[in-house]
Every structure is written in C-alpha cells, then in structure tokens.
C-alpha cells in the first residue's frame, strides 16, 4: 500500500525564472509530519534540490532554501522554485514521506518537466 | 504505403517568440514536389498555420506566410515559426505530402509541443 503522488507533467517557468506547481498525495493520512523533497533528474542521476518537513504548525516550508518555497494544506503541497535559468530546464520530481506517526509511507511523483527560457537583456537606457 | 514523419516532441520558443524544429520523413523518395503543411491542434480541431511546396529549385518555402519560414534538404525540412506569444502555446503538427511524380504519399508527425513565454516588458528608459 504505497501513497500515490501526483504532479503536473509540464510547467513553464515565468520570464522571471519562477516555476510553481502542486504536489498532491493520496490516500490522505492523519499524519503529524510530512517530508517533501524536490529532486532533479538528469540522465540516471537524482540530485536533491530542496527538502522540508511540514507539520500541523509548520505549514510553510523550505525556510533554509533560498530557491524553494512551499505551503502545505491537507494532502497538497504548493511548490515554488525560483531563480531558474535555461540551464535548469529539466525533470523535477516530488517525493513525499509520511514520517510520523508510523506506518511510514513514501511515494514519488512521475516528475514535472520545467521549461525555462532566459529573458533577453533589456537595452541599456541612454 | 504511408511515409513516416518525425518531429521533436517539445520545443521552447525563444524570448523573441521564435520556435525552430526539424520535420523529417522516411523512406526518402526521389520526389520533384514535396508539400509541407504546419497544423495546430487545439482540442479535436486542426487549423492550418502555413503550407508550402518545395521543389529541387525552390528549397526555401513559406514565402507567402509572414510567420513561417523553412528550408528543404533531401528529406528534412527545417521549420521556423515566429511572432509566437504565450497564447500560441500548443501542439504543432507537420504534414508531408509527396506530390509528384506518382505514387502520392502522405504522412503526419505526432506533433511538436511548442511552449511560449511572453517576455516581461523592459522598464521605460528615463
């Protein structure tokens, strides 16, 4: 009995390099601590982008990460990654762990392909 | 006998609203006239974006279409669509018809998802 994690397949970063997407899990469990990790997949390698633990009191996460922010509500996390550039285009996976109390559950989404286009520099003002 | 048409699944438009992608067909036939049509699929509807006929002499196409340009070489067409805006994000299909001499062949690619992000306006220069 695993948890199902769903996330959108594609998201476009804004011209400011900000991408937002939801990460949801089901079935919803009465959980005191939920850990959410954002991973980037490049080739066969996974690298951790950011991670946080949400609780009933801590519904705003990723305070230690300048590039990530997120809010938690029931079984949905709204994730935002900022400071993205074209080289950061790639597949970003949302991993959800129901940490406490037991039983421990873990699930991984199929990934959100984030596309980033670098803006053209504005012309110098004379 | 149909021809196989291949095109990339995803392309990002530049910040200037320009998207380029190849459209190739196989098997390669010795053909005097090749007609290439770019179609946009929205829901269950197809709308023609632009079309042109390439010959041995006319290897530059879409001269009648301000938003399309393309070059033809053997069994590959390099397509460029410009003037794209965020609302133009969508699936663009490449249709290839071997017009002459007989036999007539036709094939359609699976489509290229073009993503377009509108650039932020530059601040007014004082």
């Amino acid at each position: 009995e695993a948890i199902q994690v769903t996330q959108p397949s594609v998201v476009l970063a804004s011209s400011h390099g900000v991408a937002s997407f939801p990460c949801e899990y089901s079935p919803s469990h009465n959980t005191d601590e939920v850990r959410v990790t954002v991973l980037r997949q490049t080739n066969d390698q996974m690298t951790e982008v950011c991670a946080t633990t949400f609780t009933e009191k801590n519904t705003v996460g990723f305070l230690d990460y300048p590039f990530c922010s997120g809010t938690f509500n029931e079984s949905r996390v709204n994730l935002t990654i900022q400071g993205l550039r074209a080289v950061d285009t790639g597949l970003y996976l949302c991993k959800v762990e129901l940490m406490y109390p037991p039983p421990y559950f873990v699930g991984m989404g199929n990934g959100t392909q984030i596309y980033v286009i670098d803006p053209e520099p504005c012309p110098d003002s004379d | 006998e149909a021809i196989q048409v291949t095109q990339p699944s995803v392309v990002l438009a530049s910040s200037h609203g320009v998207a380029s992608f190849p459209c190739e067909y196989s098997p390669s036939h010795n053909t005097d006239e090749v007609r290439v049509t770019v179609l946009r699929q929205t829901n269950d509807q197809m709308t023609e974006v632009c079309a042109t006929t390439f010959t041995e002499k006319n290897t530059v196409g879409f001269l009648d279409y301000p938003f399309c340009s393309g070059t033809f070489n053997e069994s590959r067409v390099n397509l460029t669509i410009q003037g794209l805006r965020a609302v133009d994000t969508g699936l663009y299909l490449c249709k290839v018809e071997l017009m002459y001499p007989p036999p007539y062949f036709v094939g359609m690619g699976n489509g290229t998802q073009i993503y377009v992000i509108d650039p932020e306006p530059c601040p007014d220069s004082d």
Partner: antibody
Framework: EVQLVESGGGLVQPGGSLRLSCAAS????????MHWVRQAPGKGLEWVSG????????SYADSVKGRFTISRDNSKNTLYLQMNSLRAEDTAVYYC?????????????????WGQGTLVTVSS | DIQMTQSPSSLSASVGDRVTITCQAS??????LNWYQQKPGKAPKLLIY???NLETGVPSRFSGSGSGTDFTFTISSLQPEDIATYYC?????????FGQGTKVEIK
Amino acid sequence: EVQLVESGGGLVQPGGSLRLSCAASGFTFSSSSMHWVRQAPGKGLEWVSGISGSGGSTSYADSVKGRFTISRDNSKNTLYLQMNSLRAEDTAVYYCARYLMSFNLTRTSWFDVWGQGTLVTVSS
Amino acid sequence: DIQMTQSPSSLSASVGDRVTITCQASQAISNYLNWYQQKPGKAPKLLIYDASNLETGVPSRFSGSGSGTDFTFTISSLQPEDIATYYCQQGDAWPWTFGQGTKVEIK
C-alpha cells in the same frame, strides 16, 4: 555497525523519577523515528513511546501518558525517556528501538534495530 | 487498539521437528504482520516482516504466511539455537501492538 545502547536504569521508589538514555551509532539518527518498548518481568512486549526524526512529533501509550516524556538530541545521537511519577507496574526492561524508514520499501511497519535494554525497578 | 492473540503460549518440540505458531488479529490488518525472536536475556530480533518477507540474514527455515486476521509462523526444522520466545506484531494501525509471545523449548 548499527548500534543502540541504553543506560540510566536502576532502582527507584514509587513516585520517583528516572531518565533513560539511548546512544545511537552507525546510521543517520536524525532521520530515524525512535521508540521505547518495555517488557515487564516474564511478560510480553509493550510499546511505550515514540518520536519523529526531527523531534517535532511524539506519541505515548495510554498507560504512561502525562508521566513519561520522550525527547532526543540529534547533535548527540541520543534518545531520552524522562519517567516521572513511577509506579510498580512500570517495572520492566526498557528497550530503545529504531523504526525502519527505507526508500526501497514504500511502506514499513516494524522495528529493525533494538538496544540490549536497561532494567527499571520501581519498588519501596 | 488492535489486539493480537498468539497460540500456543508455549510448546516443546524435538530437534528437526516442524514448529507452527499462529497469531490472530482482532481486526483485519492486511499483510502488515511482523515476527520477532527473543532469546533469554537478549533483545528482540526481527525475523519476518509484512507476513512473509524474510529479514536479511535470517535462515530460510523460518517462514511466515497469512493475510487479514490469521497468520502463521513456521520453523521447518527446529534447531537448538531456535530456543526463544517468538512474538507477532501488527503494523497496520498505530500504535503497534504485540502478541503475548510463544515460548519454544526443546524436548
């Protein structure tokens, strides 16, 4: 080698207090949920209390709620059980146990590593 | 809390015998049933998790089966080192609860 070593047990009078410690080594302590399980002389196993890896969430058996407090110091890789208002029925060997959380398994529900135990005797 | 009932509470068997212990849950727990071995004066040791999965390093003479409310633990050929008390534990609903144990002795 993954290891848990309990200490702090002993003889205490009813109504007294005792603090048990469990020193962990050989694994990432801060990401592991840790628990206390006790065994009264000649009896079976009873789960007592648990704490999440971060220390932010705790839970207790009804029999000890309000009297026992579980805590952890992740910088010292140590788990604690503060036992107050002790009763004769709290007499037992107290084991600390790691609750397995593995990304190789989508769901886990068992204690995979146990300490050797420390005996707590409540008697006048 | 879910109640776990083990039987028998004790048994005596000869070396080489097949030994079977049963565990019954007060409500259905799917396959979330674990078995531990506890030798005298020692800590419990996980043998089987999720009803039938053998923990790494545990001899293959130990096995488990069952689902729902009724579970079985088997030692296919009893060895002298298997003298211990065996406990089942449900892992379906928190808090985890244990059976009262089955003491296995050699005749």
